[in-house]
Protein backbone atom coordinates (compact mmCIF):
# COMPACT_ATOMS: atom_id res chain seq x y z
CA UNK A 1 0.00 0.00 0.00
CA UNK A 2 0.97 3.57 -0.60
CA UNK A 3 2.32 5.30 2.41
CA UNK A 4 -0.09 7.70 3.89
CA UNK A 5 0.73 11.62 3.31
CA UNK A 6 -1.63 12.35 6.47
CA UNK A 7 -2.74 10.96 9.62
CA UNK A 8 -5.72 11.15 11.64
CA UNK A 9 -6.34 13.27 14.52
CA UNK A 10 -4.35 12.23 17.36
CA UNK A 11 -1.59 11.08 15.20
CA UNK A 12 1.44 12.24 13.60
CA UNK A 13 3.08 11.48 10.01
CA UNK A 14 6.59 9.73 10.63
CA UNK A 15 8.89 7.36 8.60
CA UNK A 16 6.25 7.09 6.18
CA UNK A 17 3.91 6.22 9.02
CA UNK A 18 1.03 7.23 11.30
CA UNK A 19 2.06 7.12 14.78
CA UNK A 20 0.04 7.92 17.65
CA UNK A 21 0.52 10.82 19.99
CA UNK A 22 1.02 11.10 23.32
CA UNK A 23 -1.92 12.12 25.49
CA UNK A 24 -1.87 15.11 27.72
CA UNK A 25 0.11 14.32 30.96
CA UNK A 26 2.66 12.12 28.84
CA UNK A 27 5.99 12.74 26.54
CA UNK A 28 7.29 10.81 23.66
CA UNK A 29 9.85 8.11 24.51
CA UNK A 30 10.01 6.18 20.84
CA UNK A 31 8.23 6.56 18.14
CA UNK A 32 5.97 3.91 16.80
CA UNK A 33 7.25 1.07 14.02
CA UNK A 34 5.68 -1.42 11.75
CA UNK A 35 5.67 -3.55 14.68
CA UNK A 36 5.47 -1.51 17.77
CA UNK A 37 3.12 1.29 18.93
CA UNK A 38 4.56 4.82 19.98
CA UNK A 39 6.18 4.29 23.39
CA UNK A 40 4.96 7.16 26.44
CA UNK A 41 5.72 8.18 29.76
CA UNK A 42 4.00 10.12 31.96
CA UNK A 43 5.13 13.64 33.10
CA UNK A 44 6.73 13.57 36.57
CA UNK A 45 5.84 15.99 39.60
CA UNK A 46 5.93 19.79 38.66
CA UNK A 47 5.79 18.55 35.18
CA UNK A 48 3.04 18.73 32.65
CA UNK A 49 1.93 18.94 29.05
CA UNK A 50 -1.44 19.82 27.98
CA UNK A 51 -2.12 18.72 24.80
CA UNK A 52 -1.76 15.62 22.53
CA UNK A 53 1.68 15.67 21.92
CA UNK A 54 5.40 14.21 20.48
CA UNK A 55 7.30 15.99 23.02
CA UNK A 56 10.35 14.48 24.17
CA UNK A 57 10.38 16.61 27.40
CA UNK A 58 7.26 17.83 29.57
CA UNK A 59 7.60 21.08 30.67
CA UNK A 60 8.00 22.62 34.03
CA UNK A 61 5.05 24.08 36.24
CA UNK A 62 5.21 28.00 36.33
CA UNK A 63 6.33 29.12 39.73
CA UNK A 64 3.75 32.01 41.04
CA UNK A 65 6.71 33.95 42.55
CA UNK A 66 5.41 35.75 45.65
CA UNK A 67 8.53 38.35 45.24
CA UNK A 68 6.77 40.07 42.40
CA UNK A 69 3.36 39.77 43.89
CA UNK A 70 2.69 36.54 42.55
CA UNK A 71 0.19 33.95 44.01
CA UNK A 72 -1.29 30.31 43.04
CA UNK A 73 -4.54 30.73 41.78
CA UNK A 74 -4.51 26.65 40.78
CA UNK A 75 -2.10 24.14 41.26
CA UNK A 76 -0.73 22.28 37.81
CA UNK A 77 -1.24 18.84 37.26
CA UNK A 78 0.45 16.37 34.61
CA UNK A 79 -1.91 17.81 32.36
CA UNK A 80 -2.19 21.57 33.25
CA UNK A 81 0.12 24.23 34.11
CA UNK A 82 0.01 26.14 37.65
CA UNK A 83 -2.00 29.04 37.11
CA UNK A 84 -0.90 32.69 38.85
CA UNK A 85 -2.80 34.94 39.91
CA UNK A 86 -1.82 38.61 42.02
CA UNK A 87 -2.07 39.70 45.75
CA UNK A 88 -4.86 41.58 47.19
CA UNK A 89 -4.89 44.58 45.67
CA UNK A 90 -2.51 44.03 42.57
CA UNK A 91 -2.88 43.09 39.10
CA UNK A 92 -1.25 41.04 36.55
CA UNK A 93 0.78 43.19 34.04
CA UNK A 94 0.09 40.32 31.01
CA UNK A 95 -2.21 37.51 30.05
CA UNK A 96 0.39 35.27 30.99
CA UNK A 97 0.70 37.02 34.71
CA UNK A 98 4.54 36.54 35.10
CA UNK A 99 4.48 39.86 37.32
CA UNK A 100 2.07 41.95 39.11
CA UNK A 101 1.43 45.91 39.68
CA UNK A 102 -0.77 47.75 42.40
CA UNK A 103 -3.88 48.50 41.25
CA UNK A 104 -4.18 52.19 40.28
CA UNK A 105 -6.29 54.56 42.06
CA UNK A 106 -8.95 56.55 40.75
CA UNK A 107 -7.85 60.89 41.42
CA UNK A 108 -10.60 63.16 43.19
CA UNK A 109 -13.08 63.96 40.29
CA UNK A 110 -13.10 60.60 39.09
CA UNK A 111 -14.81 57.56 40.65
CA UNK A 112 -14.40 53.73 40.27
CA UNK A 113 -16.29 52.56 37.36
CA UNK A 114 -15.07 48.77 37.31
CA UNK A 115 -13.39 47.32 40.55
CA UNK A 116 -9.65 46.13 39.68
CA UNK A 117 -9.39 41.81 39.67
CA UNK A 118 -6.17 39.93 39.99
CA UNK A 119 -6.06 40.27 36.20
CA UNK A 120 -7.75 43.54 35.47
CA UNK A 121 -6.95 47.03 36.36
CA UNK A 122 -9.02 49.68 37.96
CA UNK A 123 -11.55 51.17 35.18
CA UNK A 124 -12.09 54.77 36.37
CA UNK A 125 -14.79 57.49 34.80
CA UNK A 126 -14.74 61.16 35.24
CA UNK A 127 -17.81 61.99 37.68
CA UNK A 128 -20.64 63.60 35.82
CA UNK A 129 -22.81 66.65 36.70
CA UNK A 130 -24.34 65.79 39.66
CA UNK A 131 -21.55 63.48 41.13
CA UNK A 132 -18.32 63.77 43.10
CA UNK A 133 -15.23 61.96 44.13
CA UNK A 134 -12.93 64.02 46.85
CA UNK A 135 -10.82 61.14 47.55
CA UNK A 136 -8.27 59.03 45.28
CA UNK A 137 -9.21 55.60 45.54
CA UNK A 138 -9.32 52.21 44.10
CA UNK A 139 -12.77 51.20 45.73
CA UNK A 140 -14.94 54.63 45.64
CA UNK A 141 -17.64 55.27 42.97
CA UNK A 142 -18.30 58.52 41.83
CA UNK A 143 -21.39 59.94 45.03
CA UNK A 144 -24.36 62.02 44.26
CA UNK A 145 -24.50 65.72 45.61
CA UNK A 146 -26.20 66.10 48.36
CA UNK A 147 -30.20 66.78 47.80
CA UNK A 148 -30.56 70.25 49.73
CA UNK A 149 -34.01 70.07 49.35
CA UNK A 150 -35.11 66.89 50.82
CA UNK A 151 -33.64 67.88 53.97
CA UNK A 152 -35.67 71.05 53.63
CA UNK A 153 -32.21 73.05 53.23
CA UNK A 154 -30.80 75.29 50.25
CA UNK A 155 -27.99 74.97 48.03
CA UNK A 156 -25.10 77.69 49.70
CA UNK A 157 -22.18 76.51 47.58
CA UNK A 158 -22.85 74.81 44.39
CA UNK A 159 -20.87 71.13 43.97
CA UNK A 160 -17.72 69.78 41.59
CA UNK A 161 -16.78 66.80 40.30
CA UNK A 162 -14.39 66.76 43.25
CA UNK A 163 -16.67 68.78 45.97
CA UNK A 164 -20.19 68.09 46.95
CA UNK A 165 -22.72 70.78 47.34
CA UNK A 166 -22.92 72.95 50.72
CA UNK A 167 -26.41 72.90 51.86
CA UNK A 168 -27.83 75.91 53.81
CA UNK A 169 -30.90 77.65 56.11
CA UNK A 170 -33.62 78.61 53.77
CA UNK A 171 -33.73 82.39 54.08
CA UNK A 172 -36.50 83.43 56.35
CA UNK A 173 -37.24 86.82 54.22
CA UNK A 174 -39.89 86.52 52.28
CA UNK A 175 -40.78 89.55 49.78
CA UNK B 1 12.33 34.21 54.05
CA UNK B 2 10.96 30.08 53.44
CA UNK B 3 11.21 27.90 56.56
CA UNK B 4 9.65 24.31 57.10
CA UNK B 5 10.18 24.00 60.81
CA UNK B 6 9.54 21.10 62.71
CA UNK B 7 8.54 20.01 65.73
CA UNK B 8 11.18 18.57 68.50
CA UNK B 9 12.98 15.57 69.01
CA UNK B 10 10.50 12.25 70.10
CA UNK B 11 11.13 9.16 72.14
CA UNK B 12 8.58 6.84 72.30
CA UNK B 13 8.24 3.28 73.41
CA UNK B 14 7.85 -0.06 70.81
CA UNK B 15 3.87 -0.07 69.50
CA UNK B 16 3.65 3.65 70.13
CA UNK B 17 2.53 6.53 67.81
CA UNK B 18 4.08 9.40 67.22
CA UNK B 19 2.74 12.81 65.28
CA UNK B 20 5.50 15.32 63.86
CA UNK B 21 4.33 18.64 62.82
CA UNK B 22 5.79 20.58 60.35
CA UNK B 23 5.07 24.27 60.26
CA UNK B 24 5.72 26.46 57.23
CA UNK B 25 6.29 30.17 56.59
CA UNK B 26 6.82 32.74 53.33
CA UNK B 27 4.41 30.57 51.05
CA UNK B 28 1.12 29.33 51.12
CA UNK B 29 1.10 25.82 52.30
CA UNK B 30 -1.78 24.64 49.32
CA UNK B 31 0.90 25.37 46.63
CA UNK B 32 3.17 22.85 47.18
CA UNK B 33 3.38 19.20 48.00
CA UNK B 34 4.49 17.98 51.16
CA UNK B 35 6.83 15.26 51.20
CA UNK B 36 8.07 12.82 54.33
CA UNK B 37 11.25 11.23 54.28
CA UNK B 38 12.55 8.85 56.63
CA UNK B 39 16.69 8.37 57.21
CA UNK B 40 17.85 5.46 59.59
CA UNK B 41 21.14 6.67 60.97
CA UNK B 42 23.53 5.85 59.02
CA UNK B 43 21.64 4.82 56.35
CA UNK B 44 20.36 6.35 52.76
CA UNK B 45 17.02 8.33 52.37
CA UNK B 46 13.63 6.61 52.38
CA UNK B 47 10.31 8.38 50.51
CA UNK B 48 7.40 7.82 52.89
CA UNK B 49 4.63 9.31 51.14
CA UNK B 50 3.34 12.39 50.49
CA UNK B 51 0.05 15.22 51.01
CA UNK B 52 -1.78 17.53 48.95
CA UNK B 53 -2.68 20.10 51.51
CA UNK B 54 -5.85 21.55 49.32
CA UNK B 55 -7.43 18.45 49.02
CA UNK B 56 -5.78 16.37 51.54
CA UNK B 57 -4.89 13.93 48.76
CA UNK B 58 -2.51 11.22 50.21
CA UNK B 59 -0.08 8.72 48.11
CA UNK B 60 2.09 6.58 50.72
CA UNK B 61 4.74 3.95 49.98
CA UNK B 62 3.39 0.58 50.44
CA UNK B 63 5.62 -0.21 53.15
CA UNK B 64 4.41 2.10 55.54
CA UNK B 65 0.80 1.89 54.64
CA UNK B 66 -1.74 1.14 57.30
CA UNK B 67 0.53 2.64 59.67
CA UNK B 68 1.47 6.27 58.57
CA UNK B 69 -1.27 8.51 58.00
CA UNK B 70 -0.45 12.33 56.50
CA UNK B 71 -2.31 15.17 57.08
CA UNK B 72 -2.34 19.47 56.95
CA UNK B 73 -4.23 21.92 58.48
CA UNK B 74 -4.21 24.89 56.11
CA UNK B 75 -5.41 27.59 58.39
CA UNK B 76 -2.09 27.06 60.19
CA UNK B 77 0.10 26.27 57.08
CA UNK B 78 1.48 23.13 59.48
CA UNK B 79 1.58 19.01 58.22
CA UNK B 80 1.99 16.34 59.79
CA UNK B 81 2.72 13.11 59.39
CA UNK B 82 1.47 9.98 62.18
CA UNK B 83 3.19 6.99 62.32
CA UNK B 84 2.00 3.84 64.68
CA UNK B 85 2.77 0.67 65.57
CA UNK B 86 6.65 1.67 65.91
CA UNK B 87 9.30 -0.63 66.32
CA UNK B 88 12.95 -0.22 66.59
CA UNK B 89 13.88 0.05 62.96
CA UNK B 90 12.06 3.08 63.16
CA UNK B 91 14.13 4.78 65.16
CA UNK B 92 14.72 7.91 62.63
CA UNK B 93 15.47 11.42 61.61
CA UNK B 94 11.77 12.05 59.31
CA UNK B 95 12.33 15.21 57.32
CA UNK B 96 9.33 17.44 55.59
CA UNK B 97 10.13 18.81 52.02
CA UNK B 98 7.73 20.12 49.69
CA UNK B 99 7.62 19.68 45.55
CA UNK B 100 9.88 21.89 43.57
CA UNK B 101 9.31 24.81 41.33
CA UNK B 102 12.30 26.27 39.01
CA UNK B 103 13.68 28.98 40.55
CA UNK B 104 12.90 27.59 44.22
CA UNK B 105 15.32 25.67 46.13
CA UNK B 106 12.84 22.61 47.02
CA UNK B 107 12.66 23.23 51.11
CA UNK B 108 13.11 20.95 53.25
CA UNK B 109 12.80 21.10 57.63
CA UNK B 110 15.51 20.55 59.81
CA UNK B 111 14.46 16.77 60.39
CA UNK B 112 12.61 15.44 63.96
CA UNK B 113 14.48 12.54 65.63
CA UNK B 114 12.46 9.25 66.85
CA UNK B 115 14.08 7.09 69.00
CA UNK B 116 12.09 4.16 69.48
CA UNK B 117 13.53 1.88 72.86
CA UNK B 118 11.92 0.10 75.46
CA UNK C 1 8.24 -0.23 42.36
CA UNK C 2 10.95 1.70 40.43
CA UNK C 3 14.49 0.84 42.22
CA UNK C 4 17.41 3.36 41.91
CA UNK C 5 20.63 2.10 41.59
CA UNK C 6 23.28 4.53 42.71
CA UNK C 7 27.26 3.55 41.81
CA UNK C 8 29.53 3.66 42.99
CA UNK C 9 28.28 3.57 46.90
CA UNK C 10 31.52 5.53 47.80
CA UNK C 11 34.25 7.41 46.23
CA UNK C 12 37.78 8.98 47.16
CA UNK C 13 39.17 12.00 45.18
CA UNK C 14 40.79 15.28 45.91
CA UNK C 15 40.26 18.50 45.63
CA UNK C 16 39.97 19.77 41.79
CA UNK C 17 39.09 16.31 40.75
CA UNK C 18 36.22 15.45 38.08
CA UNK C 19 33.88 13.09 40.27
CA UNK C 20 31.05 11.33 37.99
CA UNK C 21 28.11 9.72 40.16
CA UNK C 22 25.56 7.51 37.75
CA UNK C 23 21.88 6.44 39.07
CA UNK C 24 20.30 3.75 37.19
CA UNK C 25 16.27 3.45 37.24
CA UNK C 26 15.04 -0.72 36.40
CA UNK C 27 12.11 1.42 34.23
CA UNK C 28 11.86 4.79 32.16
CA UNK C 29 11.60 7.74 34.43
CA UNK C 30 10.63 11.02 32.87
CA UNK C 31 13.49 13.09 35.06
CA UNK C 32 15.62 12.79 38.70
CA UNK C 33 16.08 15.34 41.26
CA UNK C 34 19.97 15.15 42.78
CA UNK C 35 20.31 15.81 46.49
CA UNK C 36 23.48 16.69 48.21
CA UNK C 37 23.58 15.75 51.83
CA UNK C 38 26.50 16.96 54.86
CA UNK C 39 25.93 14.94 57.72
CA UNK C 40 23.20 15.92 60.97
CA UNK C 41 21.86 18.44 58.08
CA UNK C 42 18.84 17.97 55.92
CA UNK C 43 19.23 17.54 52.23
CA UNK C 44 19.53 20.12 49.61
CA UNK C 45 18.37 20.17 46.16
CA UNK C 46 21.57 20.31 43.74
CA UNK C 47 19.67 19.71 40.42
CA UNK C 48 15.87 19.21 39.31
CA UNK C 49 14.66 17.78 35.98
CA UNK C 50 17.69 15.86 35.10
CA UNK C 51 19.94 18.71 34.22
CA UNK C 52 18.50 22.23 35.46
CA UNK C 53 20.82 23.74 38.60
CA UNK C 54 18.71 24.68 41.69
CA UNK C 55 18.96 28.25 42.68
CA UNK C 56 22.19 28.95 44.18
CA UNK C 57 24.10 25.81 42.85
CA UNK C 58 27.57 26.32 41.54
CA UNK C 59 28.07 25.41 37.70
CA UNK C 60 30.05 22.91 38.98
CA UNK C 61 27.74 20.57 39.10
CA UNK C 62 25.88 18.96 36.19
CA UNK C 63 23.03 16.34 35.55
CA UNK C 64 22.47 14.51 32.26
CA UNK C 65 20.66 11.70 31.25
CA UNK C 66 17.13 10.00 30.14
CA UNK C 67 14.93 7.12 30.29
CA UNK C 68 17.17 5.28 33.19
CA UNK C 69 20.48 6.01 32.75
CA UNK C 70 21.30 9.32 34.28
CA UNK C 71 24.80 11.05 35.61
CA UNK C 72 25.87 13.88 38.02
CA UNK C 73 28.89 15.51 37.87
CA UNK C 74 31.03 17.88 39.61
CA UNK C 75 33.71 19.23 37.20
CA UNK C 76 36.34 20.24 39.67
CA UNK C 77 35.39 19.31 43.29
CA UNK C 78 35.96 21.50 45.83
CA UNK C 79 36.54 21.46 50.05
CA UNK C 80 32.82 21.97 50.48
CA UNK C 81 31.52 19.30 47.85
CA UNK C 82 32.57 16.05 50.00
CA UNK C 83 28.88 14.87 51.16
CA UNK C 84 26.90 12.10 50.08
CA UNK C 85 24.76 12.30 47.12
CA UNK C 86 21.29 10.99 46.18
CA UNK C 87 18.93 10.88 43.27
CA UNK C 88 15.85 10.22 43.54
CA UNK C 89 12.62 9.75 40.74
CA UNK C 90 9.53 11.72 41.27
CA UNK C 91 7.77 10.22 37.65
CA UNK C 92 5.87 6.85 39.26
CA UNK C 93 4.82 5.91 43.13
CA UNK C 94 6.05 5.22 44.96
CA UNK C 95 8.78 8.04 44.64
CA UNK C 96 12.59 5.98 45.35
CA UNK C 97 15.52 7.58 46.04
CA UNK C 98 18.92 5.98 45.36
CA UNK C 99 21.03 4.35 47.58
CA UNK C 100 23.40 7.20 47.81
CA UNK C 101 27.07 7.95 47.21
CA UNK C 102 29.65 9.22 50.03
CA UNK C 103 32.28 11.41 48.70
CA UNK C 104 35.07 11.31 50.37
CA UNK C 105 38.43 13.15 51.05
CA UNK C 106 41.45 10.91 49.52
Known amino acids: PEPPTACREKQYLINSQCCSLCQPGQKLVSDCTEFTETECLPCGESEFLDTWNRETHCHQHKYCDPNLGLRVQQKGTSETDTICTCEEGWHCTSEACESCVLHRSCSPGFGVKQIATGVSDTICEPCPVGFFSNVSSAFEKCHPWTSCETKDLVVQQAGTNKTDVVCGPQDRLRA | EVQLVQSGAEVKKPGATVKISCKVSGFNIKDYYIHWVKQRPGKGLEWMGRIDPEDGDTKYDPKFQGRVTMTADTSTDTAYMELSSLRSEDTAVYYC???????????WGQGTTVTVSS | DIQMTQSPSSLSASVGDRVTITCSAT?????ILWFQQKPGKAPKLLIY???NLASGVPARFSGSGSGTDFTLTISSLQPEDFATYYC?????????FGGGTKVEIK
Open chain 2, 97 to 107: TTSYYVGTYGY
Open chain 3, 49 to 51: STS
Open chain 3, 27 to 31: SSVSY
Open chain 3, 88 to 96: QQRTFYPYT
